[in-house]
């Protein structure tokens, strides 16, 4: 099969890299400079993706593949391929459609991307507030209120010492 | 499958016009709050405008209010961009996008679906 496609289509003999030209006769000519083939059998080379501005390059642009941008500090990628470079916000912050915004009251956000989520409500799970949270940090949840009445222990007793050779029951 | 599919990019002289339109697919266009974002060449991605689900309701960045003028059609499942007086400033690739259930207004940001972008370029 393959020889019989080559003899139909002289380009399916062409490697990644190049091009079949058909103005030389479909020969296989070298891809020009900033541009590529990923596949064999192409008839045009793309050019490559230049990454200017807020884009830098993360790969450079080969005969063979395309380049890859990242963003510059400040930004994250978004987008298939990074198509895209959205701002960075601080800790404590979130990007709305106007820029970067301080969490309201009673939520935080720890990264430097997404959104202020709310704290987490210890009491749905019957504990109290050990540390409360900041616009940077949820709270932490401690033990229980009744574990510390008083005359209750919030230390909890070590787990009796098994016997040598004895397996657990 | 979910897609956004953005034309009507090109070249244009400053004060000139351009429609930029977004065909969505996949999903129900009706339903969702739409929103147009651009990437310049030298900066981060910044919004441009958006609008509700019924079309009841636009929003617009302070850069481009009383110039820009975002529409839909939710019959053609379409978004659009009419951009007046264009400035080389307005320079970027233009990108459709989904918003979740939150991104309604100016404020949210909750996209959830992008387009691959149109380039504008505003030049003499």
């Known amino acids: 099969f393959e020889r019989t496609r080559s003899l139909q289509d002289p380009c399916s003999n062409c490697p990644a890299g190049t091009f079949c030209d058909n103005n030389r006769n479909q020969i296989c000519s070298p891809c020009p400079p900033n541009s590529f083939s990923s596949a064999g059998g192409q008839r045009t080379c793309d050019i490559c993706r230049q990454c200017k501005g807020v884009f830098r390059t993360r790969k450079e642009c080969s005969s063979t593949s395309n380049a890859e941008c990242d963003c510059t500090p400040g930004f994250h990628c978004l987008g298939a391929g990074c198509s895209m470079c959205e701002q960075d916000c601080k800790q404590g912050q979130e990007l709305t459609k106007k820029g970067c915004k301080d969490c309201c009251f009673g939520t935080f956000n720890d990264q430097k991307r997404g959104i202020c989520r709310p704290w987490t409500n210890c009491s749905l799970d019957g504990k109290s507030v050990l540390v409360n949270g900041t616009k940077e940090r949820d709270v932490v949840c401690g033990p229980s209120p009744a574990d510390l009445s008083p005359g209750a222990s919030s230390v909890t007793p070590p787990a009796p010492a098994r016997e040598p050779g004895h397996s657990p029951q | 499958e979910v897609q956004l599919l953005e034309s009507g990019g090109g070249l244009v002289q400053p004060g000139g016009s351009l429609r930029l339109s977004c065909a969505a697919s996949?999903?129900?266009?009706?339903?969702?709050?739409m929103s147009w974002f651009r990437q310049p060449p030298e900066t981060g991605l910044k919004w441009v405008s958006s609008?509700?689900?019924?079309?009841?309701?636009?929003y617009y960045a302070d850069s481009v209010k009383g110039r820009f003028t975002i529409s839909r059609d939710n019959s053609k499942n379409t978004l659009y961009l009419q951009m007046n007086s264009l400035r080389a400033e307005d320079t970027a690739v233009y990108y459709c996008?989904?918003?979740?259930?939150?991104?309604?207004?100016?404020?949210?940001?909750?996209?959830?679906?992008w387009g691959q972008g149109t380039t504008v370029t505003v030049s003499s």
């Open positions: 996008a989904k918003e979740g259930s939150h991104g309604t207004d100016d404020s949210h940001y909750d996209v959830d679906v």
């Open positions: 996949g999903f129900t266009f009706s339903n969702y709050a």
């Open positions: 609008i509700d689900a019924s079309g009841g309701d636009t």
